[in-house]
Amino acid sequence: DSSKWNIEHPGTIYAWEGACVWVPCTYRVLDGALETFILFHNPEYNQNMSKFEGTRLYESTKDGKLPSGQKRVQFLGNKINNNCTLSIHPVHVNDSGQLGLRMVSKTEKWMERIHLNVSERPFPPRIQLPPKLQESQEVTLTCLLNFSCYGYQIQLQWLLEGVPMRQAAVTLTSLSTKSVFTRSELKFSPQWSHHGKIVTCELHDVDGKVLSEDMVQLNVKHTPKLTIEVTPNETTVRKGDSVTMTCKVNSSNPEYTTVSWLKDGIPLKEQNTLMLTLHKVTKSQSGRYCCRVSNDVGPATSEKVFLQVQYAPESSRVQISQSPAVEGSEVNFLCISPANPLPTNYTWYHNGKEVQGRTEKQFQIQKILPWHAGTYSCEAENILGIGERGPGTELDVQYPPKKVTMVIENPTPIREGDTVTLSCNYSSSNPIVNHYEWRPRGAWEEPSLGVLKIQNIGWNNTAVACAACNNWCSWASPVTLNVLYAPRGVRVRKIKPLSEIHSGNSVSLQCDFSSSHPKEVQFFWEKNGSLLGKESQLNFDSISPEDAGSYSCWVNNSIGQTASKAWTLEVLYAPRRLRVSMSQGNQVMEGKTATLICESDANPPVYSYAWFDWNNQSLPYSGRMLRLEPVKVQHSGAYWCQGTNRVGKGHSPLITLTVYYSPQTIGRR
């Protein structure tokens, strides 16, 4: 009953004469254990005897040991691990047929058939290619041989056009119940040049002898392979010549379908054959040419051919590194004149005149100057001729105003308070002068550009400078205005004494002034409107109080005179001219009030008074006023006073006071 038995093996085993076979086999029986195992060669069932007959190659015993007999057949399995693997070594052609595995358990019997195919000669391996080979796309080539046996070593080797392939192949061997094979896998990137080439897989024995082989021709799909040819074979041609370029398709798989031509990467219109002819070439036809050919794989582009059309230099133009250029800077001139071949000689012109010794494409002036301004042009020359001189390029050289000077427009001399007009002049400037600057800065009027009007000029306006300005300012040397003015800073200064003036001192006063233009001056001293002297000093040998007062000095020059502020001369002296006065007269009736006043002339004023009677007896009064109230007859007599200041003392003459009796007193008597 087949449902009770499960036996696994490859089904058919292939080998060749003298090789060996290895039959991987496993079994499983549902009902009990395997008791007997017999290997038949081409078994046939005898109906009469109800048993299988045929050549017995192997028979198991009760103890499971191998019997003596067929040495080339080996049962490699055992009942314990359900293995029924066997090998035949060597194997012969007449071993072809069926191998019958008769299996008997306590209750069940089964015959399993395995096909054995032994050929006379080693059979070839089979090369398996992917459905499509395309250049540079990596694929795996497989060489398969339905054979493998542990007792017989083989090797698969790859060849391309009979030459062993350098790429490393991976060999896989399978000896499983599912399949028995040897397979070699080779990773391979076909190139277009492999198209049509033969790939061989050789089967080698252990000694390296070739036993068999399989061959395939490669069909590598690739884009067209191109070369380009030029006739005449020079790619440097002269303007007006004709040139033919041919695109050769060296290989294409599949056949090419379209052709086009490109110049500098841009397709040429209506050029779709393998030949491109350029008649009477022009300069503009110089460039890099190539052809593009497409097939179903894709487009291919040939290498580029650089076509150089030679021509004489064209009309030149001059490129200037900077214009306007600032004076003193570096300026580079470049002569641009398309030509092929490049010009070998250049001639430079400045304002139409040849610049000697300059024969290169670039002309440099390291420090540009105003006279370098103008039109620069050039001529270029190559083997085909001299180019036309272009119109030239203008160089503008900018510089600060030159030779700036200042002129005083006034008639001289200039007096303080005059209106002075100054003009600022220059010789040249680029760009034009657009403003002026003046030093020192003042609230001055600029009636027109470059003219300065100073109204009411100050005595101290000594020097003025102007600058003419464009992008830069250039300063003129300062002009001294030489303003004439009356003496300034006139003042009275006491030279001696150094301290305060006391009556009798020697006194000197100086008339000072700070400045005068012109320098020549005269002096005048004045007191209360009276002229005192004409020297710079006023001297008093012995000063008296009468000399005190308000003094002024005057200094004059040819422009005018200046007075000092009034200066007060103060003379200090002891009290003098003392006298006693009586407001009510010198005769007073008793009982009334008698007031005596001590009057004095003193500088500084009297600070202390003393009173004395006719006996020079000091009275107990210290004020300026002596008040007797009520006055008595016995107060009659002579009185005097004394005044004191910090300079000294002075006293008055005697004055007599007469006190007479009142009518009441007389009446009483």
Epitope: G328, Q366, L369, P370, Y399, K402
Partner: antibody, heavy 124, light 110 residues
Framework: QVTLKESGPGILQPSQTLSLTCSFS??????????VGWIRQPSGKGLEWLAH???????YYNPALKSRLTISKDTSKNQVFLKIANVDTADTATYYC????????????????WGTGTTVTVSA | QAVVTQESALTTSPGETVTLTCRSS?????????ANWVQEKPDHLFTGLIG???NRAPGVPARFSGSLIGDKAALTITGAQTEDEAIYFC?????????FGSGTKVTVLG
């Protein structure tokens, strides 16, 4: 007539600063295209360019000596000065000043007029 | 720093043509080197002859001419005269400084 005259200390000691004056006449350094340069010549040897200054205050120095050199001008006094700091005996030479000019109508400069030189000795 | 090389001495005869050269250690001399030629006569009398490779200074005799010959600057005296006996220095400009050559002593055999 263009003339240039160099003046200097004659003799000085190592590590001192050499001060040279070039007094010129016949041209002005306020004029476009004018410059003055200093060149020296050790006894029996060749010329060595030191520095030059242009009318527009552009200054150029010998790179090997740049850290020690200072060139300046006083346009109003028609003088150009050169200072060489930290002198050594190797600075012993005759020092020349020369006008460098770009004459009218020319595009390049010339060392056209030279002074007669001043001898400087650096000695310990 | 560059080195500027000149012939140490040249001898010529009156009326002959003599060419002095000036080589730069940094490569070919170009117009960008603004070659200057200076003449030194006895008693340290220096005169500028040529500027900007090939321009004669004002007042310099026409027999003096400057040029580039190959990779060198050159000074040619066409029809040398006895008064041309002197030392000739070339100076080359290197973008921001001059370097003088060692000088060529020219002898004009009378």
């Amino acid at each position: 007539q263009v003339t240039l005259k160099e003046s200097g200390p004659g003799i000085l000691q190592p590590s001192q600063t050499l001060s040279l004056t070039c007094s010129f006449s016949g041209f002005s350094l306020s004029t476009s295209g004018m410059g003055v340069g200093w060149i020296r010549q050790p006894s029996g040897k060749g010329l060595e360019w030191l520095a030059h200054i242009w009318w527009d205050d552009d200054e150029y120095y010998n790179p090997a000596l740049k850290s020690r050199l200072t060139i300046s001008k006083d346009t109003s006094k028609n003088q150009v000065f050169l200072k060489i700091a930290n002198v050594d005996t190797a600075d012993t030479a005759t020092y020349y000043c020369a006008r460098i000019s770009i004459p009218y109508g020319y595009y390049d400069w010339f060392f056209d007029v030279w002074g007669t030189g001043t001898t400087v000795t650096v000695s310990a | 720093q560059a080195v500027v090389t000149q012939e140490s001495a040249l001898t010529t005869s009156p009326g002959e043509t003599v060419t002095l050269t000036c080589r730069s250690s940094t490569g070919a001399v170009t117009t960008r080197n603004y070659a200057n030629w200076v003449q030194e006569k006895p008693d340290h009398l220096f005169t500028g002859l040529i500027g900007g490779t090939n321009n004669r200074a004002p007042g310099v005799p026409a027999r003096f001419s400057g040029s580039l010959i190959g990779d060198k600057a050159a000074l040619t005296i066409t029809g040398a005269q006895t008064e041309d006996e002197a030392i000739y220095f070339c100076a080359l400009w290197y973008s921001n400084h001059f370097i003088f050559g060692s000088g060529t002593k020219v002898t004009v055999l009378g």
